[in-house]
C-alpha cells in the first residue's frame, strides 16, 4: 500500500495473507468459513511451493493470539484466467478446515448486485504489499482509502487504454495506491467487498495508471458454484 497508514490491529478480520513457503505472497479475503478469495495470478509462479493462508494477523512476524496458518486443500483459479491478461483474475482457496471464527477472524459480505460503485465513492484497500518505490515490505497490515474512478476515464489511452471491461473497476492512484504484494486483497466499499486487487505488473502511485480491481459481483455465479 502506497501513501497509506498502519491499519488498526484486527479491525479487518476478513484479511488474509496468502503465503508461499512461509512468506507473504498476496492478499486475500475470507468470504466463507472455509474459503479465501484472492487473485489467480498469485499462484502462477507457485509451482511446487507450499501455499498456505494466514488469518487473524496484523503483524506478519510477531506472535498474536488470533493468528493461525491454514493449509490449502484446494486452489480454484477462475477457468478463464490467463497469464497475459488482467481479466478474470480471481482465485478461491479452500482451507484444510473451517476457520476458527472470532473477533479477529470473520468472513466479509461480498457484493452480489451487479451494479457499478458510484465514481467518487471512498473504498478501503488493505494489504502487506510494498509501501514505497524502493520495495520496502511492511510487517504490519497497511490500508488506504481510495476514491472509485469512472470506467471511461480509466479506459482513456493515457490510463488503461480500453482494457477495463465491465467486470473490472478502477480506483484513483495519485500517490495513494495498492501495489506489489497487495494483489488478491479486498477493496471494501461501505463494509461490503466490491473488488479484488488485480495482480498485473502495474506501476503504482501514478495518477494516470489507476488501480485495477476485479468486481466480485460480476463473478457471483462462479463464486457460488465453487463454494457450493
Amino acid at each position: 500500500i502506497l501513501g497509506g497508514r498502519e491499519a488498526e490491529a484486527h479491525a479487518r478480520p476478513y484479511m488474509a495473507s496468502v503465503q508461499l513457503n512461509g512468506a507473504h505472497l498476496c492478499g486475500g479475503v475470507l468470504v466463507a468459513e472455509q474459503w479465501v478469495l484472492s487473485a489467480a495470478h498469485c499462484l502462477e509462479d507457485a509451482a511446487d511451493g507450499k501455499v498456505q493462508v494466514l488469518l487473524g494477523a496484523h503483524s506478519l512476524s510477531q506472535p498474536e493470539p488470533s493468528k493461525r496458518l491454514y493449509d490449502v486443500l484446494r486452489a480454484v483459479p477462475h477457468p478463464d484466467s490467463q497469464p497475459d491478461t488482467i481479466d478474470h483474475d480471481l482465485l478461491l482457496l479452500q482451507l484444510s478446515e473451517k476457520a476458527t471464527l472470532g473477533p479477529a477472524v470473520r468472513p466479509l459480505p461480498w457484493q452480489r448486485v451487479d451494479r457499478d460503485v458510484a465514481p467518487g465513492t471512498l473504498c478501503d484497500v488493505a494489504g502487506w504489499g510494498i509501501v514505497n518505490h524502493a520495495g520496502r515490505r511492511p510487517d504490519s497490515l497497511q490500508h488506504v482509502l481510495l476514491p472509485v474512478l469512472d470506467r471511461a476515464t480509466c479506459n482513456r489511452r493515457t490510463h488503461h487504454d480500453g482494457a477495463i471491461t465491465e467486470r473490472l473497476m478502477c480506483a484513483e492512484s495519485n500517490r495513494r495506491d495498492s501495489c506489489k504484494g497487495d494483489s488478491g486483497g479486498p477493496l471494501v466499499c461501505g463494509g461490503v467487498l466490491e473488488g479484488v486487487v488485480t495482480s498485473g505488473s502495474r506501476v503504482c502511485g501514478n495518477r494516470k495508471k489507476p488501480g485495477i480491481y476485479t468486481r466480485v459481483a460480476s463473478y457471483a455465479a462462479w463464486i457460488d458454484s465453487v463454494l457450493a
Epitope: 470506467r151 471511461a152 476515464t153 479506459n155 493515457t158 480500453g162 506501476v203
Partner: antibody, heavy 116, light 112 residues
Framework: EVQLVESGGGLVQPGGSLRLSCAAS????????MNWVRQAPGKGLEWIGD????????DYNADFKRRFTFSLDTSKSTAYLQMNSLRAEDTAVYYC?????????WGQGTLVTVSS | DIQLTQSPSSLSASVGDRVTITCRSS???????????LEWYQQKPGKAPILLIY???NRFSGVPSRFSGSGSGTDFTLTISSLQPEDFATYYC?????????FGQGTKVEIK
C-alpha cells in the same frame, strides 16, 4: 460489434447552426470517452475535443471552444456536437471516435457543407 | 500545441517496395506516466481512419505484420516492409500524450 453512426450533416448557410449525432452500439456507452474529429475536403484530420459520458466533462481544442458544444443522451447511447456560427471553413466530414483502445473505432462520418 | 510534421507529404512506390514515413514532433511526446502515445492511422478515400500502430511500435489487432513503428522522443517512423495493393492510402501520425491531441498533415502513398 462496436458501431458508431453519425447523422445530422447537410447544407447550412454561413452563420447557421447544426447538431450532429453519434449513436453508439455494441458496447456500454458510459465506459469510454467520445471524441470528435473533422476533416476538411482534401485536408488532414483535426481533433475537435472529447466528452466523458459519465461526468459530462469536456475538453475542447481551443479553435472550437466558443462555437462548438458537446452533449450526451446516455439513455440513447448518443453523443451530440452542436455547431453554431458556422463558416465556410467549417465545411468538412465530421467523425466521432471512441477512445479506448486508442481511436480504434470510428463512425462513417457525416458531411457538413457551409455555403450560401 | 504540439505540431507533428510528416515527411514526405506524398510518395510513389511499387508493390513489394519497402516504404518509410517519418513523423517529427515539435516537442517530446513522452507522457508524464512514462509512455509515449504516438499512433499511426491509415485512411482511404471516403472512409474513416483505421488504427495501425499505438504507443510507437505496437500493432493493433488484425494489422498485418508488414506494418511496423519505431522511434522515441521526437522522431518516429512507420515502415511498410513490402507494399501491397491495398496499402495505397494516406497515413497519419497522431500524438495523444498532450492536450490538444494532434495529427500530422498526412502522407499519401500512391502507385508508381
Amino acid at each position: 460489434e462496436v458501431q458508431l453512426v453519425e447523422s445530422g450533416g447537410g447544407l447550412v448557410q454561413p452563420g447557421g447552426s447544426l447538431r450532429l449525432s453519434c449513436a453508439a452500439s455494441g458496447y456500454t456507452f458510459t465506459d469510454y470517452y467520445m471524441n470528435w474529429v473533422r476533416q476538411a475536403p482534401g485536408k488532414g484530420l483535426e481533433w475537435i475535443g472529447d466528452i466523458n459520458p459519465v461526468t459530462g466533462d469536456t475538453d475542447y481544442n481551443a479553435d472550437f471552444k466558443r462555437r462548438f458544444t458537446f452533449s450526451l443522451d446516455t439513455s440513447k447511447s448518443t453523443a451530440y456536437l452542436q455547431m453554431n456560427s458556422l463558416r465556410a471553413e467549417d465545411t468538412a466530414v465530421y467523425y466521432c471516435t471512441r477512445e479506448g483502445p486508442s481511436f480504434a473505432y470510428w463512425g462513417q462520418g457525416t458531411l457538413v457543407t457551409v455555403s450560401s | 500545441d504540439i505540431q507533428l510534421t510528416q515527411s514526405p507529404s506524398s510518395l510513389s512506390a511499387s508493390v513489394g517496395d519497402r516504404v518509410t514515413i517519418t513523423c517529427r514532433s515539435s516537442q517530446t511526446i513522452v507522457h508524464d506516466n512514462g509512455d509515449t502515445y504516438l499512433e499511426w492511422y491509415q485512411q482511404k478515400p471516403g472512409k474513416a481512419p483505421i488504427l495501425l500502430i499505438y504507443k510507437v511500435s505496437n500493432r493493433f489487432s488484425g494489422v498485418p505484420s508488414r506494418f511496423s513503428g519505431s522511434g522515441s522522443g521526437t522522431d518516429f517512423t512507420l515502415t511498410i516492409s513490402s507494399l501491397q495493393p491495398e496499402d495505397f492510402a494516406t497515413y497519419y501520425c497522431f500524438q495523444g500524450s498532450h492536450v490538444p491531441v494532434t495529427f500530422g498533415q498526412g502522407t499519401k502513398v500512391e502507385i508508381k
